[in-house]
Each structure stands twice: as C-alpha cells, then as structure tokens.
C-alpha cells in the first residue's frame, strides 16, 4: 500500500475497496492481476481468476486504465471492457467500453491509454473482469494498467 | 468553488477534499497549481509548493488530467505522472501514469488529454505531485488541467 | 440497474448519484441522456432535458465519457465539455473539458474516446450538462457514452 | 466567396503600442486558426502568430513573443493582433491568412496593413 | 529550427518556357511543404500543398514535387499573369519561409 502498512482496523465497518494493477504474466482473457505485492488493495471484496467479486450489494464507483503500446504502429483496433458476471444471468454485462481505432501513424512506436469509470448498482456475488482485445499490446507496469472500485 | 460560498460547516468532521487547477507561470516540475481562485477547493489537505499535502491517514481517490497540445505536431513522448513522496522513505513513488507516443500528425496542429484516477491507501505526511514530461506543451485552463482527491 | 432491482431502501438518508447512458436521438446541444432503461441509476438527484440537477448542497464528483468515432478521419476538432447552469447566474461554467486535434489518420475509419472527472462543490438547483462539439461523430452506446455523478 | 481585411496600421513611435484587427466572411470564421503574417518591405515572408479556433491556444514566434498577443472575438467574426513595446524592425506589411484544416499552410490571405515604426 | 533556402534567388524566362524553382530543407521535412506566389502590392496566392498536391483553381500547369529535403516547382508553360515571386513553407516542424524566388520577363 504504497509503501504503508494499512491503517489500523476501526470499529467502523470494513470499507469495500480494491486496486489491482497489472500482472505481466496474463495470458488469455479476461485479465488477470497482481492482488498481493506494490500498490495494491483489496479490502472487503475477494479477487477471484480475474475478477473482483462482490460481496455487499449497493453503489459502487469502478474504474480501469490499460496502457497499450507497441513497436511499430499498424492501428489494429484496441478495445478496453469492464464487464459483469453473474451466474444468475446468462450474458456477461458490458459495464464501460473503450475502443480505439487509426490513433497512431503506421511504423511508428507507439502508446495510448484508455481510461473508464463510473457508477454502477451491484450485487453480491456479481464478478467484475476487464478484457482487452490485444494483450500482446498491453504494457503491465503496476502505475500503468489497473483494476479498481470502491463502495459508496 | 464553482461560484458558490462554500457549504455550511456542519458537525461532522470536515470532510478532506481536494480540486486544483492549473497554473500557466508554472516553470519547473513537479506542476504547480492554483489552489485560491476559480473552480478551486482545498478542505482537510494543505497545498505546499505543488503538491497535496496528507494530513489523516486513510483512503483517498485520487485523480489528475493533464491537457497537452502544441502548434506544430512533433510527436515528442509525453507523460504524465502522480506521484508520492514522503520523507520516511528514500525513492518517490510512481502512482500513476499515462504516456503517449505517436498520437499526432506530423506537422498539424494537436491536442490531447491524458486522465488518471484510482485509489489509494495514503499515509499523513504523503505528499503527492503532479509531473509532466514538457511543460511547454501543457494547457493549463481550469477546466482542461488539474489535479484532486478526496478522502472516501 | 446492471439487471439488479435496486437495494432495498435504507433507513439511513438516500444517496445521491446519477449514471445516465448515451440516447441515440440526441439532436441538438446538450446531449440527452438515457434515464430509465439499461444500465442507468437515477437517485436524490433529477433529470431534466439534458440536464442532472443538483437538489442538495454539497460536494460531488463528477464524470463523463464519450465516445467518437467516424467513417473517414477528417482531423474535425472535437471538444466534450461537462458545465453548469443555474439561473442566479449569466454565464454557463466550464468544470471540466476535454479537446482532441489530429488524433487519427486522414482518410481512415477511427474512433478515440474523451474521460472527465472531478470534484465539485454543487449548490442545490445547479444543472449539469454535457456538450459535444460534432453530434454525428458520437456513438450513444450505453457502455460507451455515459455521465454521472455522486454526492461524497 | 472568402474574404479577410486587415486595418488599424499607421506609424508608430518605438516603443508604442498598436492594435490590429481582421474582419473576415464568407466562412464560418469560428471553425478555423488564423494566422498573423508579416513581410518587411522588400522582403520575405515571416509568420508572426496563430490562434485556435476557438480561441483556447496561441503560439507565437520568438521575435514577437511577449510583446504581441494574439486574439479573436468569434461572436463579430474578427481577429486582432496588439503589439506593444514596438521596434523599427516589426515594420512590415501585416497579413491575416486562414489556416488550411489546422495544417500551418494557409489558404487564403488579406490584403495587408502597412505599420511603420518610426521616430 | 528549419531553415528553407530557394534557388535560383531571381530566373529570367520568356513566355512559354518550362521553368524549375528549387526548395531545400535544412533537415528532413517528409512532404510538408507549400508554395505561394506573390505578385508586387498584393498578397500571397495559395498553390500546392504537400509538396504536390495542387490547390483548386491553379492552373494545371503548375506542379510540385519532392520530398525530405529537395522540393520543385515546376512552370510546365509559362504564362504572362505567371511572373511574380514565389515563396516555399514548410509546415513540418513549426512555420518557415524560403526568402522567395522572383521570376522577371527576359
């Protein structure tokens, strides 16, 4: 927790709240993250195969950021998703997209972030992924790509 | 603060936030900011030669946009950075970053944003700055470039 | 809400938050806001022709996203501005904006997306509101263009 | 059909200061950057400023930079060039030009004002 | 900063001739460079952008080409409302001028 160890616990409630930043090693989708070690927290919601689960229904505000680069620009199209899963509903929810497309000039190096957040009603035991649509573009670096949210 | 007197003081503690704007005499990193005039507000956090200043330990949502433009499109790598300091600790911490490469034109006029938000577990006494990798390629309207927190 | 009824009321005092979602009929400025189907949130806080209006005093963040995109880059600058209303003053505010400038290749298929968010102090009857400088190059999907808000 | 016309050119001491201005039409004038150009008699061509738009950006070169400040008012279609601390060596034939869809060229010109800085 | 240096400085030519007027760029400046004439009294008149790409409404006589440092345009049939002087500007880093090239009657 930046370098803190984290506060000492209150007698208040346990406040819900996770950031997760990017783990090098993911290999297929949705994305996997560092959950333990650098600037990393995770309080009060369990983080499973990818996915932040919920473990208290209310509002929570969730957000993503996913640095992508690469060697030499071809403008493949490059999507960000943060979506919802519940075993209750068949289809995974798309909660927030980003998508960019001809955002760099070919044979170039190139970078671009792609940022998301915003406000949803959760569910206990709804699962939250981020997916990407070129992982090999995706720089990990915990400052760079991560996965967060916190309950109102 | 958005041309309104700001809030009654109520009971409650007062509630640690943070909205700073740009300041175009900035000169040097980390930015500067403007912290008494404007769309400005400073509750609970001091302002110290750039940076917010942690006064309760806690979680904080922190967030900045940086917007960059230019006249004559280059391509120079640009970067935006919050980071921590604090003097317990040797090293500042990187927090957050964007970096964009190949994002314009050659030769066009340009402008891009880069935004940054996530939380995090601060400590009393942290100080956070704001750094960019060229000054001159920064606009600093009020609206356009910033940087804040507030305490969950 | 993400398919979820709403949590069942608290005797604690109702939150206050907004997410609304892109209306693909959108026809002039403002933008126009999906307020009741989908993945929207609508509570302690009214919407009313384009506009989230503020009912308590207090402090909120704020945030918005859009989505363009186009069928032939032309390089038209595009402009997302969230700014406030209210009717003891003249002049609309700017609290945040976002500009984009030869961000894609001329001639081909593109899309970029504009991310603002922040704190602001809001005083009851404030309206907010999002604006767009190209109408026609924004795409309304709910996961793409949204904007939002809750009181801290 | 396109049109932008300079005025308020004159002699002026070193030192003083003048104000220029350009009132454009037969274009949406708040869609496009306008430069400043200037050209000293019998000589070439020297770009002076630019303004965005929306009037949000300016950019100026070296030679001018802190003395001259570049504006535009969208709502009257005109844009405006205010020299202060003038030298012998900004007198020049003053052009206004429309930049060509934000690439630094520029597509059409004015027909220029004379300021001459003399004592 | 780029400098941009024309030559020849003046070119004597009678009507009908085939005229070359040469640009360089003190350093790379891919194809963005524009030309411009410019006639005593008056101001510049837009013609090619992109170092070959002519504006509409100039004559087809008119061309450009080049591309790094080396730029011409080319008078295929000189005309007698064509002499005038001619000015390069590159618009790849910045805004630069050449010192112009005035093209008289011989």
């Known amino acids: 927790q930046i370098g803190h160890p984290s506060p000492p616990p209150e007698k208040k409630e346990q406040r819900k709240v996770a950031h997760l930043t990017g783990k090098p090693n993911s290999r297929s989708m949705p994305l996997e993250w560092e959950d333990t070690y650098g600037i990393v927290l995770l309080s009060g919601v369990k983080y499973k195969k990818g996915g932040l689960v919920i473990n208290e229904t209310g509002l929570y505000f969730v957000y993503s950021k996913v640095y992508f680069r690469g060697q030499s620009c071809t403008n493949l199209p490059l999507s960000h998703k943060v979506y919802m899963r519940n075993s209750k509903y068949p289809q995974d929810l798309v909660m927030m997209e980003g998508k960019m497309m001809s955002y760099c000039t070919t044979g170039q190096m190139w970078a671009h972030s792609s940022y998301l957040g915003a406000v949803f009603n959760l569910t206990s035991a709804d699962h939250l992924y981020v997916n990407v649509s070129e992982l090999s573009l995706v720089n990990f670096e915990e400052s760079q790509t991560f996965f967060g949210l916190y309950k109102l | 603060q958005i041309g309104h007197p700001s809030p009654p003081p109520e009971k409650k503690e007062q509630r640690k936030v943070a909205h700073l704007t740009g300041k175009p005499n900035s000169r040097s990193m980390p930015l500067e900011w403007e912290d008494t005039y404007g769309i400005v507000l400073l509750s609970g956090v001091k302002y110290k030669k750039g940076g917010l200043v942690i006064n309760e330990t806690g979680l904080y949502f922190v967030y900045s946009k940086v917007y960059f433009r230019g006249q004559s499109c280059t391509n120079l790598p640009l970067s935006h950075k919050v980071y921590m300091r604090n003097s317990k600790y040797p090293q500042d911490l990187v927090m957050m970053e964007g970096k964009m490469m190949s994002y314009c034109t050659t030769g066009q006029m340009w402008a891009h944003s880069s935004y940054l938000g996530a939380v995090f577990n601060l400590t009393s006494a942290d100080h956070l700055y704001v750094n960019v990798s060229e000054l001159s390629l920064v606009n600093f309207e009020e609206s356009q470039t910033f940087f804040g927190l507030y305490k969950l | 809400q993400i398919g979820h009824p709403s949590p069942p009321p608290e005797k604690k005092e109702q939150r206050k938050v907004a997410h609304l979602t892109g209306k693909p009929n959108s026809r002039s400025m403002p933008l126009e806001w999906e307020d009741t189907y989908g993945i929207v949130l609508l509570s302690g806080v009214k919407y009313k022709k384009g506009g989230l209006v503020i009912n308590e005093t207090g402090l909120y963040f704020v945030y918005s996203k859009v989505y363009f995109r186009g069928q032939s880059c032309t390089n038209l600058p595009l402009s997302h501005k969230v700014y406030m209303r209210n009717s003891k003053y003249p002049q609309d505010l700017v609290m945040m904006e976002g500009k984009m400038m030869s961000y894609c290749t001329t001639g081909q298929m593109w899309a970029h997306s504009s991310y603002l968010g922040a704190v602001f102090n809001l005083t009851s009857a404030d309206h907010l509101y999002v604006n767009v400088s190209e109408l026609s190059l924004v795409n309304f999907e709910e996961s793409q263009t949204f904007f939002g808000l809750y009181k801290l | 059909q396109v049109q932008l016309v300079e005025s308020g050119g004159g002699v002026v001491q070193p030192g003083r200061s003048l104000r220029l201005s350009c009132a454009a039409s037969?274009?949406?004038?708040?869609?496009?950057?306008i430069h400043w150009v200037r050209q000293a008699p019998g000589k070439g061509l020297e770009w002076v400023a630019v303004?965005?738009?929306?009037?949000?950006?300016?950019f100026y070169a070296d030679s001018v930079k802190g003395r001259f400040t570049i504006s535009r008012d969208n709502s009257k279609n005109t844009l405006y060039l205010q020299m202060n601390s003038l030298r012998a060596e900004d007198t020049a034939v003053y052009y206004c030009?429309?930049?060509?869809?934000?690439?630094?060229?520029?597509?059409?010109w004015g027909q220029g004002t004379l300021v001459t800085v003399s004592s | 900063d780029i400098q941009m240096t024309q030559s020849p400085s003046t070119l004597s030519a009678s009507v009908g001739d085939r005229v070359t007027i040469t640009c360089r760029a003190s350093?790379?400046?891919?194809?963005?460079l524009a030309w411009y004439q410019q006639k005593p009294g008056k101001a510049p008149k837009f013609l090619i952008y992109?170092?070959?790409s002519l504006e509409s409404g100039v004559p087809s006589r008119f061309s450009g080409s080049g591309s790094g440092t080396e730029f011409t345009l080319t008078i295929s049939s000189l005309q007698p409302d064509d002499f005038a002087t001619y000015y390069c500007?590159?618009?790849?880093?910045?805004?630069?001028f050449g010192q112009g090239t005035r093209l008289e009657i011989k």
């Open positions: 030009a429309r930049d060509r869809d934000n690439w630094n060229y520029f597509d059409y």
């Open positions: 037969g274009f949406t004038f708040s869609t496009y950057g």
């Open positions: 303004i965005w738009y929306d009037g949000s950006d300016k």
């Open positions: 350093q790379s400046i891919s194809s963005w």
């Open positions: 992109q170092a070959s």
């Open positions: 500007q590159q618009y790849n880093s910045y805004i630069t």
